[in-house]
């Protein structure tokens, strides 16, 4: 088992909004849960976009999940990752 490296980034979207993206990389096996939480509970699937789980060329995998949020509300969101029985949460950088 190779645990993922998780990185959260933010980028400008439309006025007053930002897109936050949670990337998991360099993990094996390929089964992973990557999702956003808002106010400590699950964010609905229809407000999240997932990338495919793809090989990264080193025998490991990468994927991502993104959502659009209002600027100033970053503190309400965390990215949750679960892989091979281990899990972690990751805040949006300010």
């Amino acid at each position: 088992t190779v645990p993922p490296m998780v990185n959260v980034t933010r980028s400008e979207a439309s006025e007053g909004n930002i897109t936050v993206t949670c990337r998991a990389s360099s993990f094996y096996p390929r089964n992973i849960i990557l999702t956003w939480r808002q106010d400590g509970v699950s964010l609905s699937n229809d407000t999240q976009q997932w990338g495919d789980v793809l090989p990264d060329g080193n025998g490991t995998y990468q994927t991502w999940v993104a959502t659009r949020i209002c600027r100033g509300e970053e503190q309400r969101f965390t990215c949750y990752m679960e892989h091979s029985g281990n899990h972690s949460t990751h805040p949006v950088p300010s």
Epitope: V41, S42, E82, H87
Partner: antibody, heavy 119, light 107 residues
Amino acid sequence: DVQLQGSGPGLVKPSQSLSLTCSVTGYSITNDYYWNWIRQFPGNKLEWMGFISFGGSNNYNPSLKNRISITRDTSKNQFFLKLSSVTTEDTATYYCARYDGRGAWFAYWAQGTLVTVSA
Amino acid sequence: DIQMTQSPASLSASVGETVTITCRASGNIHNYLAWYQQKQGKSPQLLVYDAITLADGVPSRFSGSGSGTQYSLKINSLQPEDFGNYYCQHFWSFPLTFGAGTKVEIK
């Protein structure tokens, strides 16, 4: 370390409003986290009532309809529960509690405040 | 709303025994589950979150497991201080709801 302390009247008459205060020490309620009210009925059933967040937003249990209000006084580092039009069914031990944005589990609780609704 | 059904409602066990408490959610809660212990006259205390993670200071004889709609709390080698009420709580969505509780008594 953060501490929460609930307070308020132990007896409320039916049809009146129940008002409780949670005083927080060791952490500013505007910095982060979600500041909740939970009650436990006789017989031990637990019910989440709602929260006020670090930013001042609310989320309430729909079962309480329009009877509940959670507000705060940032200068005193306190948050408040107001439950209107109470009946004897609102007799319970009321807890204030905190969770963080990693997940809505309650790591910090105040001691309970028993509120009896009776004429 | 997601309903949480806990079983058994009560159990009697001796010190040193292993006990298991189960919690069933009315929908898939994807491991968004916490367990609490409550002693008589005290506030609930967090034991486990994210279905499997022990809270700070919780002894390793406690363990959480499960997935989907079915979850368990196991206590290995029950100690005198473990007697009390245990509750599960989901945090998949609002409103947050708790199980009705399991009372663990001394046999």
